[in-house]
C-alpha cells in the first residue's frame, strides 16, 4: 500500500523577485514516476499550466518569457503518478518589481553608526503608498514590511534599529507597494551601505544567505527595535 505522494519542490530561477520584462523559469520537482506536472496560481482558474516531465521525469519547467503584473502571485504545483496526484507543494510567491517609481532610502542620523547606538533607515516615496519593504542583501530574512492600517497612505516609513550590532551592517534597499497586491513592488531604491564601527560585543560576521532561500541555523534575522512611527503603520514579518 503506497503512502501519500510527497509534495513536490517548487522554486523559481533566477529567483522569486523579478524585474518587469525579465524572464523567469518556475521549476516543479517530483519523482521518477511523475507523468504530468500541474501549476496552479492563486485566484486563477486551475490549472494555470500543465507540463510533461523533462527527462529523467522528476521535474518540469514552466517558463515566463517576460515578467508582467499578470504573472505576479502565489503558485503551487502538483505531479501525477500512476497512484494519483501528489499533495500540493509549498507556495511560491512570485513578486514583480518595477511597478512603481523607486523610493529613496537614507539613514538617520548617518549611515556610519557606532555599535550599541541607534540608527533609523528612512524609505520615502514620491507618491503615497501603504506598504514599505526593507531588504538587506544576503540576509537570511531579507524582508521587513511596514504596512499601513486602514488603508492609510504614507509617503515614508521609518525602520529604527537599536541597539545596532555588526549583524546590522551591510547593503540595504527599500521598495514601496500598494496593499491591493503585495506581489507588485516599486523599482528598488538606490543601495544604502550601513557601516557599523567599533563592534566588540558581536564579533560574528554578517549572515551571507541570498534573498529567498531557506535560513540555516547560524542565520540571524534583521530585527529592528523601537516603536514604529507614523501612527497607522505596523511592522510585519513575512
Amino acid at each position: 500500500q503506497a503512502g501519500p505522494l510527497p509534495k513536490p519542490t517548487l522554486w523559481a530561477e533566477p529567483g522569486s523577485v523579478i524585474s518587469w520584462g525579465n524572464s523567469v523559469t518556475i521549476w516543479c520537482q517530483g519523482t521518477l514516476e511523475a507523468r504530468e506536472y500541474r501549476l496552479d496560481k492563486e485566484e486563477s482558474p486551475a490549472p494555470w499550466d500543465r507540463q510533461n516531465p523533462l527527462e529523467p521525469k522528476n521535474k518540469a519547467r514552466f517558463s515566463i518569457p517576460s515578467m508582467t503584473e499578470d504573472y505576479a502571485g502565489r503558485y503551487r504545483c502538483y505531479y501525477r503518478s500512476p497512484v494519483g496526484w501528489s499533495q500540493p507543494s509549498d507556495p511560491l510567491e512570485l513578486v514583480m518589481t518595477g511597478a512603481y517609481s523607486k523610493p529613496t532610502l537614507s539613514a538617520l542620523p548617518s549611515p556610519l553608526v557606532t555599535s550599541g547606538k541607534s540608527v533609523t533607515l528612512l524609505c520615502q516615496s514620491r507618491s503615497p503608498m501603504d506598504t514599505f519593504l526593507l531588504i538587506k542583501e544576503r540576509a537570511a530574512h531579507p524582508l521587513l514590511h511596514l504596512r499601513s492600517e486602514h488603508g492609510a497612505q504614507q509617503h515614508q516609513a521609518e525602520f529604527p534599529m537599536s541597539p545596532v550590532t555588526s549583524v546590522h551592517g551591510g547593503t540595504y534597499r527599500c521598495f514601496s507597494s500598494h496593499g491591493f497586491s503585495h506581489y507588485l513592488l516599486s523599482h528598488p531604491s538606490d543601495p544604502l551601505e550601513l557601516i557599523v564601527s567599533g563592534s566588540l560585543e558581536d564579533p560574528r560576521p554578517s549572515p551571507t544567505r541570498s534573498v529567498s532561500t531557506a535560513a540555516g541555523p547560524e542565520d540571524q534575522p534583521l530585527m529592528p527595535t523601537g516603536s514604529v512611527p507614523h501612527s497607522g503603520l505596523r511592522r510585519h514579518w513575512e
Epitope: Q1, A2, G3, P4, L5, P6, T9, W11, E13, W27, Q29, T31, L32, E33, L54, E55, P56, N58, K59, R61, S81, P82, V83
Partner: antibody, heavy 116, light 107 residues
C-alpha cells in the same frame, strides 16, 4: 527522523554474489525513489543504481548492468542490491540514498570486499 | 555519458578564506547539478541542489551558482568544519555521474 541503514557487506571471492539491504525509516518509503552509490577505497563516488518509488523503473550504469539488480519491498521499507559476478573493482563502501531531486539522505555505508 | 570535471582537485586554504570550486559538464545540464560534502569515514551530505537551491540546516556560507555546463560552489568564509571533500553530481540524464572530487585542506 529519516534513517537509512545498510547491511550485507563482507568479503567475497571474485565471481561470487552478495545481497545488500537497506532498512529505511522516518519517511514514506514507498513514495520515494531510491539509489545505491559506491565509493572504492580512497576514490570518489560512483552511482550504481536507482529504482523508482513503486519499483516499476530501474536504472544502471554500464559498469554494473547485467550483474547487479536493484529491488525494493515497500511493505518492509527495504531496498536491496543483488550483486552477481563480482569483480575486484567492485570493492567499495556501498551507500543507499533517498533520491529527491538530489540524494538528500544517505546511510552510513556497508563495505564490500572482493578478493581471492 | 556526461563527464563531470571538478577543479581544482585539491585546495589549501585558511579559516576565513573565500573558496570557489568549479564543476564542468561535458554537455548542458540546465540546472541538474547538485553538491555534496564528505568527511573522512562518513557518508556524503547534500549541500546544494539544482545548482543554486539552498537547504535548511546547511550554513549560509555555502552557495551555488551556474547553469548549462559550468557550475560553482562558493564557501564565503571557511570554517574549521568545512575542511572535507566536495563532489558535484549531475541528474540530467542516465547514468548519473559525479565529479572526481575536490579535497579542501587546511593551509
Amino acid at each position: 527522523e529519516v534513517q537509512l541503514v545498510e547491511s550485507g557487506g563482507g568479503l567475497v571471492k571474485p565471481g561470487g554474489s552478495l545481497r545488500l539491504s537497506c532498512a529505511a525509516s522516518g519517511f514514506a518509503f514507498s513514495s520515494y525513489d531510491m539509489s545505491w552509490v559506491r565509493q572504492a577505497p580512497g576514490k570518489g563516488l560512483e552511482w550504481v543504481s536507482t529504482i523508482s518509488s513503486s519499483g516499476s523503473y530501474t536504472y544502471y550504469p554500464d559498469s554494473v548492468k547485467g550483474r547487479f539488480t536493484i529491488s525494493r519491498d515497500n511493505a518492509k521499507n527495504s531496498l536491496y542490491l543483488q550483486m552477481n559476478s563480482l569483480r575486484a573493482e567492485d570493492t567499495a563502501v556501498y551507500y543507499c540514498a533517498r533520491l529527491w531531486g538530489a540524494m538528500d539522505y544517505w546511510g552510513q555505508g556497508t563495505l564490500v570486499t572482493v578478493s581471492s | 555519458d556526461i563527464q563531470m570535471t571538478q577543479s581544482p582537485s585539491s585546495l589549501s586554504a585558511s579559516v576565513g578564506d573565500r573558496v570557489t570550486i568549479t564543476c564542468r559538464a561535458s554537455q548542458g545540464l540546465t540546472n541538474d547539478l547538485h553538491w555534496y560534502q564528505q568527511k573522512p569515514g562518513k557518508a556524503p551530505k547534500r549541500l546544494i541542489y539544482y545548482a543554486s537551491q539552498s537547504i535548511s540546516g546547511v550554513p549560509s556560507r555555502f552557495s551555488g551558482s551556474g547553469s548549462g555546463t559550468e557550475f560553482t560552489l562558493t564557501i564565503s568564509s571557511l570554517q574549521p568544519e568545512d575542511f572535507a571533500t566536495y563532489y558535484c553530481q549531475q541528474s540530467n540524464s542516465w547514468p548519473f555521474t559525479f565529479g572526481q572530487g575536490t579535497k579542501l585542506e587546511i593551509k
